[in-house]
């Protein structure tokens, strides 16, 4: 049994780190492998993660952790029974992938504006809470040529779009993702998309 692609881990900077790797051949990850992790810290214990399959040769493990602080450093050992397949380390604060924003809602009852709101995925006491900026992707299933990214660089999780900039009488979809500039994170996954129908029509005298 051999590791083809070494574990790569990212932290949500809250309570979960996710490690993914590829094996040299088809593997029943949960039955054959264990990923052991231990914080480099006085009197810490070794904890065990049972991986899941992620495709034929891929495995993924969700490591449960306490809140993350910059000093945290973990040793990682990938075992197949009594055989140590790989040994490494992981500093969560240096490999952050934020949680995806949630509760994306479209409000179309605001006169001539489409208002999008979503929820910050972190509690106020988390360091990332006040550091997230967002990208909102809006596209149309009726008009495949239309796809826009709106960068939201302010803290409030809202975006206002003049309804007049969208075609009337067709449906649109939106999704949102986040990143934290000061923590040099990757982008989060996209939120689930939400759909709305743009029924806005310009006033008669403007046509």
């Amino acid at each position: 049994m051999k590791v083809l692609q070494e574990p790569a881990c990212v932290s949500d900077y809250m309570s979960i780190s996710t490690c993914e790797w590829k094996m040299g051949g088809p593997t029943n990850c949960s039955a054959e492998l264990r990923l052991l992790y231990q914080l480099v810290f006085q009197s810490s214990e070794t904890h065990t993660c049972v991986p899941e399959n992620n495709g034929g040769v891929g495995c993924v493990c969700h490591l449960l952790m306490d809140d993350v602080v910059s000093m945290d450093n973990y040793t990682l050992d990938l075992w197949a029974g009594q055989q140590l397949l790989w040994k490494g380390s992981f500093k969560p604060s240096e490999h952050v992938k934020p949680r995806a924003p949630g509760n994306l809602t479209v409000h179309t009852n605001v006169s001539d504006t489409v208002l999008l709101t979503w929820s910050n995925p972190y509690p106020p006491d988390n360091y990332l809470y006040n550091d997230l900026t967002y990208a909102v992707n809006i596209w149309s299933e009726n008009d495949p040529a239309y796809s826009r990214i709106h960068n939201v660089t302010y803290l409030k999780p809202t975006l206002r779009i003049p309804a007049s900039t969208l075609k009337s009488g067709i449906s649109y979809r939106a999704r949102v993702r986040a990143w934290a500039q000061h923590y040099n994170t990757t982008w989060s996954e996209w939120s689930p998309s939400t759909k709305w129908y743009n029924s806005y029509r310009e006033p008669f005298e403007q046509r």
Epitope: Q42, S43, S44, M65, M71
Partner: antibody
Framework: EVQLVESGGGLEQPGGSLRLSCAGS????????MTWVRQAPGKGLEWVSS????????YYADSVKGRFTISRDNSKNTLYLQMNSLRAEDTAVYYC??????????????????WGQGTTVTVSS | DIVMTQSPLSLPVTPGEPASISCRSS???????????VDWYLQKSGQSPQLLIY???KRASGVPDRFSGSGSGTDFTLKISRVEAEDVGFYYC?????????FGQGTKLEIK
């Protein structure tokens, strides 16, 4: 009531052995790391050894490394310190103390918040 | 190893007056914001040590509020706002960030 009671001290000749015990009660013993601290006559406090809650991780002062062994039996709620190759400078009162909660991924520390009454070890010919 | 240096080593105090003991570590014992791994212990004559302050500034259960801890990184202070006769004994700071845990030399507080 949370309590630690040491036993096993006594008079021993240089080169001899002693085994100290520390019985814990009133708390979930296996969840906490435990520590031994000693105090030579008229001197300050000196850390000797610590062990994680599971017993899987042990730590020693350089002055006792290779001679002392810390262990625990969580089924008996008891901490041990096996002292071999004793020297005159090991003469001290030995205290056990309740250390950090080590079942969490990052152990939670509340100080050495419970101490035993101490047991006296005298090494002399 | 982290060396802990206490001062003064002897502290005569008048009852009702404040007292202050300093402890300096040879390297930072700050793990993360608010988590300085320094404790303060009091050992009264013929007794086991008792915890006063942990993590730099957190008062242990049952400890009178006249005791307080402060500091961060390498410099720490134990303050007694109004010394009482029962406060006499040896005061020790200790770092527990990493083994070996190390204690200061001890400060003997006595009543004038």
């Amino acid at each position: 009531e949370v309590q630690l009671v040491e036993s096993g001290g006594g008079l021993e000749q240089p080169g001899g052995s002693l085994r100290l015990s520390c019985a814990g009660s009133g708390f979930t013993f296996r969840d906490f790391a435990m520590t031994w601290v000693r105090q030579a006559p008229g001197k300050g406090l000196e850390w000797v050894s610590s062990v994680s809650g599971s017993g899987g991780n042990t730590y020693y002062a350089d002055s006792v490394k290779g001679r002392f062994t810390i262990s625990r039996d969580n089924s008996k709620n008891t901490l041990y310190l096996q002292m071999n190759s004793l020297r005159a400078e090991d003469t001290a009162v030995y205290y056990c103390a309740k250390d950090r909660l080590s079942v969490t991924v990052r152990p939670r520390y509340y100080g050495l918040d419970v101490w035993g009454q101490g047991t006296t070890v005298t090494v002399s010919s | 190893d982290i060396v802990m240096t206490q001062s003064p080593l002897s502290l005569p105090v008048t009852p009702g007056e404040p007292a202050s003991i300093s402890c300096r570590s040879s390297q930072s014992v700050l793990y993360s914001i608010g988590y300085n791994y320094v404790d303060w212990y009091l050992q009264k004559s013929g007794q086991s040590p008792q915890l006063l302050i942990y993590l730099g500034n957190k008062r242990a259960s049952g400890v009178p509020d006249r005791f307080s801890g402060s500091g961060s990184g390498t410099d720490f202070t134990l303050k007694i706002s109004r010394v009482e006769a029962e406060d006499v004994g040896f005061y020790y700071c200790m770092q527990s960030l990493t083994s070996p845990y190390t204690f200061g030399q001890g400060t003997k507080l006595e009543i004038k």
